[in-house]
């Protein structure tokens, strides 16, 4: 006899990185017929939702109108069908951004390189932080962690055309409180084709969409959205 239901998916809309004082919605997708959803924050019960009618709803939303550092942390959700509870979802790392200062991102040897060149990103922030995060925009939402007193180096090694795209960095005051984003740096990697700067592989966005940290323009299946969010969050951990 089944003791638990499959775990639900959890994700944040528009994104798990939320500028302070902005709104965010935590979504939890379980099964049709679930009579109760519980959202847990840092291991404690945070909110409860009872969908009506349960047989027509398989997703609930928990709205946070005003993001701040107290709301940043690890969230998970569970749901119940009858008396049977689900496994807990994966952990959602909700990050508050636009805290304090703006780092400077630069790239060596320059923003236009040839496939095979050794490329290093430098993220610098003069205020009290020792952890830095480098993010590549796009559906796969790559995140790298680096350390240093005022600057972190992110060596990409010899690059390929898969590295092309737009990068930003953050200073991290703790795992869930990040600085403003740096200005973007677009890395153009030319392959073996004569004088061709290839366009980014991952879909990227008009610059203004980064303002709300939308790393994808398409929601697609909610499951997909959740999965790529988890990819980034797991890298953070």
């Amino acid at each position: 006899q089944q003791q638990t239901l499959p775990k639900p998916f959890i994700w944040a809309e528009p994104h798990f990185m939320v500028p302070k004082e902005k709104q965010v919605t935590i979504c939890c997708q379980g099964n049709y017929g679930a009579v109760e959803y519980q959202l847990h924050f840092e291991g404690s019960l945070f909110a409860v939702d009872r969908p009506k009618p349960p047989e027509r709803i398989n997703k609930v939303q928990f709205y946070i109108p005003d993001m701040n550092s107290r709301m940043a942390g690890q969230y998970s959700c569970i749901y119940r069908v009858g008396e049977l509870w689900s496994e807990p979802s994966n952990l959602l790392d909700l990050v508050v951004t636009e805290m304090y200062d703006t780092p400077t991102l630069s790239v060596h040897p320059g923003p236009e390189v040839i496939s095979g060149e050794k490329v290093t990103f430098y993220c610098r922030l003069d205020t009290a932080t020792s952890m830095f995060l480098l993010l590549k925009e796009g559906r796969s939402s790559h995140v790298q962690r680096g350390y240093g007193k005022v600057q972190a180096e992110f060596p990409l090694g010899p690059v390929t055309t898969a590295h092309r795209g737009t990068y930003r960095c953050f200073g991290s005051y703790n795992n869930h409180a990040w600085s403003f984003p740096s200005e973007p740096v677009k890395l153009l990697v030319t392959g073996d084709i004569e004088n061709t700067s290839l366009a980014p592989e991952d879909p990227t966005f008009p610059a203004d969409t980064w303002g709300t940290y939308l790393l994808t323009t398409e929601t697609g299946l909610q499951k997909d959205h959740a999965l790529w969010d988890h990819t980034a969050q797991n890298l953070l951990r």
Partner: antibody, heavy 117, light 107 residues
């Protein structure tokens, strides 16, 4: 268009210091590393080092590390290279250069530094 | 540091001649090899980057080839305005290093 305009020729005594400037225009100054290259009379080219105008980061050729200092003033898009404790073999033309695409594709006109007692 | 050995150090040729200059690196530079032209009293000018790619605006009579440690620069048909000194430069590892130069003269 991209331009790197360097300061004028200098005559210095041994032991003195010289500071060469390179005023950049026509591109985003803070995005591209500024390189400095030495060319002694009738000789080849020697890379002194590079500076990242965006954050002040530097890479030096070991040979010049103790006596060369590269700095920038972002507010006026100008890079500087100071050479201290000058000797006669520092007599050379000093160039600033940037790599806008895949190699050092823009160069200043050069600054002749003569070290003579 | 990677040593770049360029040969010959000087070369005399006639207009229309095919001219070849070689550059040998002390270790593999993975094709990150550039060629510069310098005329008297002027700054160096980039001609070829990444072994064989022509910089914008450079005439097609200039070409480059090679791999590993051995590289070649060729002028297919020498023109009077090509009289200059030519330098190779490796960009694979810091510090970038230059060859000693080849001074090209007209016969």
């Amino acid at each position: 268009q991209v331009q790197l305009v360097q300061s004028g020729a200098e005559v210095k005594k041994p032991g003195a210091s010289v500071k060469v400037s390179c005023k950049a225009s026509g591109y985003t100054f803070t995005t591209y590393w500024m390189h400095w290259v030495k060319q002694a009379p009738g000789q080849g080219l020697e890379w002194i080092g590079e500076i990242n105008p965006g954050n002040g980061g530097t890479n030096y050729n070991e040979k010049f590390k103790r006596r060369a200092t590269m700095t920038v003033d972002k507010s006026i898009s100008t890079a500087y290279m100071e050479l201290s404790r000058l000797r006669s073999d520092d007599t050379a033309v000093y160039y600033c250069a940037i790599r806008l695409r895949f190699a050092l594709d823009y160069w200043g006109q050069g600054t002749l530094v003569t070290v003579s007692s | 540091d990677i040593q770049m050995t360029q040969s010959p150090s000087s070369l005399s040729a006639s207009v229309g001649d095919r001219v070849t200059i070689t550059c040998r690196a002390s270790q593999d530079v993975r094709n990150f090899l550039n060629w510069f032209q310098q005329k008297p009293g002027k700054a160096p000018k980039l001609l070829i980057y990444f072994t064989s790619r022509l910089h914008s605006g450079v005439p097609s009579r200039f070409s480059g080839s090679g791999s590993g440690t051995d590289y070649t620069f060729t002028i297919s048909s020498l023109q009077p305005e090509d009289i200059a000194t030519y330098f190779c430069q490796q960009g694979n590892t810091l510090p970038p290093t230059f060859g000693g130069g080849t001074k090209l003269e007209i016969k």
